[in-house]
Interface confidence: low
């Protein structure tokens, strides 16, 4: 039942053009190019896309035409390497063009930048946006794809098409509304927040594949799909995992046309076979393609079958445990993971993977022992502390979140993480800690049975952001260690880090704590970021500062901002009161 076994095509580009249609083909090529050449102007990309599209059309007309038999990597790479300013704009990335495929594509992939030096996207006035939308809808939507893709070089391309469709629907509806802003802005905020979350989730999938290999990704997929489809049999889950792995391998590898095509095929297969997969798919399967694929990816867990037998019978008590393990290790471990995960929608995927790893380690040792059964008989007892650790951590942090609220909870995490890894850049610490802090509002509202999968799997996504940003400019051995040693133990590794006693405090620089009247015109979120940036810098100057000392300084700081923003001469107030605040803070912290 291999969904993806296709006949060989004389022209791969013609085949994908016909499968996807011109609109999706052009959109996906634009995304691919923008994710590779993140600094190129929009107009240059549009020109390249149009050239590729025209070429694809000639191949559709005649698959035997010149160059139509070339691989997509060859065609796209050749096109990217025609960019005149490649060396000036991208430096050593231009050296990729001297390589042959597949090395050239690998080279482009290695130069993708998770934190490109691009200006923040500023949202124009609603009337300006609506005019631009009406004047040239196609260019307006292409610009959206381009701006998102270049800032998020691993964004899941077929999902970005779904976002673009929603973006278009928002403008179509709201630009005709009586109150355009009231209609449009909440929709754009929702798309922005969902988009950031989608990008981060996909970044973790790509990191899993690229840094830890296909086996790690497949293990994740077995656990997640078994939780989601507990009524599906193991063979069905295995088949879905194989196909899903292919889709994500393609997208993470820059093969966006193949990825989108194969994702559509997988959605089709799931809907044709929903009776043997899940009872929750009916509504999803009635939707158009992009909505259908998105809906399947987010579908709620099906109900667990009644009367599932104890796991111990097959995985501990059976005399055939070592025989089964020896015959097909990964299949047997896959079955263990499937059986455990379908019984535990209340566990995080990373916890399930830790349990599977513990089980594997035990069998590896015990199946070589004199009495294997006696050796592994108590293996399930080992799971208890592994399960309790995230449960206790989530309980404690949700209590703290409920006590403090999101902003102060973020601040507590900022202090905690700055003390753990003070070498990390301040913007990264602020971004990551703010996102870690969002776990509270995202997950603590859930009942116990949903808290752990929500919280710990979300934290895995956020900590991966820290890992990919840190990898670009590594500054902390502790971050490198936690990020590279084990994908599933990243969160426990960071949780276990204590204050870095080797850190030499940063020199005090008054400029860091000098503020101006422009802070008064910032949004509440931007003002919070300014204050949180100052908090990180304070901790870097005085890592041994107590919570009480930091709270006192931050309270003074908040009062100072509030006072000066109400003053008639704001700038003078910031200058004079700012000096007093710096002096008082230095005294309070003993700087």
């Amino acid at each position: 039942r291999g969904v993806f076994r296709r006949d060989a095509h004389k022209s791969e580009v013609a085949h994908r053009f016909k499968d996807l249609g011109e609109e999706n083909f052009k959109a996906l090529v634009l995304i691919a190019f923008a994710q590779y050449l993140q600094q190129c102007p929009f107009e240059d990309h549009v020109k390249l896309v149009n050239e590729v599209t025209e070429f694809a059309k000639t191949c559709v007309a005649d698959e035997s035409a010149e160059n139509c038999d070339k691989s997509l990597h060859t065609l796209f790479g050749d096109k990217l390497c025609t960019v005149a300013t490649l060396r000036e704009t991208y430096g050593e990335m231009a050296d990729c063009c001297a390589k042959q495929e597949p090395e050239r594509n690998e080279c482009f992939l290695q130069h993708k930048d998770d934190n490109p030096n691009l200006p923040r996207l500023v949202r124009p006035e609603v009337d300006v946006m609506c005019t631009a939308f009406h004047d040239n809808e196609e260019t307006f939507l292409k610009k959206y794809l381009y701006e998102i893709a270049r800032r998020h070089p691993y964004f899941y391309a077929p999902e970005l098409l779904f976002f673009a469709k929603r973006y278009k629907a928002a403008f179509t509806e709201c630009c005709q509304a009586a109150d355009k802003a009231a209609c449009l802005l909440p929709k754009l905020d929702e798309l922005r927040d969902e988009g950031k979350a989608s990008s981060a989730k996909q970044r973790l999938k790509c990191a899993s594949l690229q840094k830890f290999g296909e086996r790690a990704f497949k293990a994740w997929a077995v656990a997640r799909l078994s939780q989601r489809f507990p009524k599906a049999e193991f063979a069905e889950v295995s088949k879905l995992v194989t196909d899903l792995t292919k889709v994500h391998t393609e997208c993470c590898h820059g093969d966006l046309l193949e990825c989108a095509d194969d994702r559509a095929d997988l959605a089709k297969y799931i809907c044709e076979n929903q009776d043997s997969i899940s009872s929750k798919l009916k509504e999803c399967c009635e939707k158009p393609l992009l909505e259908k694929s998105h809906c399947i990816a987010e579908v709620e867990n099906d109900e667990m079958p009644a009367d599932l037998p104890s796991l111990a019978a097959d995985f501990v008590e059976s005399k055939d445990v070592c025989k089964n393990y020896a015959e097909a290790k990964d299949v047997f471990l896959g079955m263990f993971l499937y059986e455990y995960a379908r019984r535990h929608p209340d566990y995080s995927v990373v916890l399930l993977l830790r349990l599977a790893k513990t089980y594997e380690t035990t069998l590896e040792k015990c199946c070589a022992a004199a009495d294997p059964h006696e050796c592994y008989a108590k293996v399930f007892d080992e799971f208890k502390p592994l399960v309790e650790e995230p449960q206790n951590l989530i309980k404690q942090n949700c209590e703290l979140f409920e006590q403090l609220g999101e902003y102060k909870f973020q601040n507590a995490l900022l202090v905690r993480y700055t003390k753990k890894v003070p070498q990390v850049s301040t913007p990264t610490l602020v971004e990551v800690s703010r996102n870690l802090g969002k776990v509270g509002s995202k997950c603590c509202k859930h009942p116990e049975a949903k808290r752990m999968p929500c919280a710990e799997d979300y934290l895995s996504v956020v900590l991966n952001q820290l890992c990919v940003l840190h990898e670009k400019t590594p500054v902390s051995d502790r971050v490198t260690k936690c990020c590279t040693e084990s994908l599933v133990n990243r969160r426990p590794c960071f949780s276990a880090l204590e204050v870095d006693e080797t850190y030499v405090p940063k020199e005090f620089n008054a400029e860091t704590f000098t503020f101006h009247a422009d802070i008064c015109t910032l949004s509440e979120k931007e003002r919070q970021i300014k204050k949180q940036t100052a908090l990180v810098e304070l901790v870097k100057h005085k890592p041994k500062a107590t919570k009480e000392q930091l709270k006192a300084v931050m309270d003074d700081f908040a009062a100072f901002v509030e006072k000066c923003c109400k003053a008639d001469d704001k700038e003078t107030c910031f200058a004079e009161e700012g000096k007093k605040l710096v002096a008082a803070s230095q005294a309070a912290l003993g700087l």
Epitope: P385, P492, A496
Partner: nanobody, 126 residues
Framework: EVQLLESGGGLVQPGGSLRLSCAAS????????VAWFRQAPGKGREFVAG????????YYADSVKGRFTISRDNSKNTLYLQMNSLRPEDTAVYYC???????????????????WGQGTLVTVSS
């Protein structure tokens, strides 16, 4: 092949302190879960304290919590057990054991440790 060598045992009065060491060779001590067990005369091997592989997550038996501290010095490839407020019931031969595969947690099940030292005797008596 992993070799473990315990030292630091001896006779101590109730309320006193001892520091046990376990020097490892053949494997880096931070790459594997390691634990201290003890065995009193006529009894089975009992888990005392453990530290995970790759990350310093520690676990203690309820009977020693707050009195004993497990740690390791990666540069010396050595595991330690600092024992304070010793009681007569702490009298036993203390063993260190190690598990392969860098599991995050130590097991409290002695059977799951393939590598052991020869043990060091701790006697708490007045």
């Amino acid at each position: 092949e992993v070799q473990l060598l315990e030292s630091g045992g001896g006779l101590v009065q109730p309320g006193g302190s001892l520091r046990l060491s376990c020097a490892a060779s053949g494997r880096y001590i931070d790459e594997t879960a390691v634990a201290w067990f003890r065995q009193a005369p006529g009894k089975g091997r009992e888990f005392v304290a453990g530290i995970g592989g790759g990350v310093d997550i520690t676990y203690y038996a309820d009977s020693v919590k707050g009195r004993f501290t497990i740690s390791r010095d990666n540069s010396k490839n050595t595991l330690y057990l600092q024992m304070n407020s010793l009681r007569p019931e702490d009298t036993a031969v203390y063993y260190c054991g190690t598990r392969p595969g860098r599991p995050l947690i130590t097991s409290k099940v002695a059977d799951l440790y393939p590598y052991w030292g020869q043990g060091t005797l701790v006697t708490v008596s007045s």
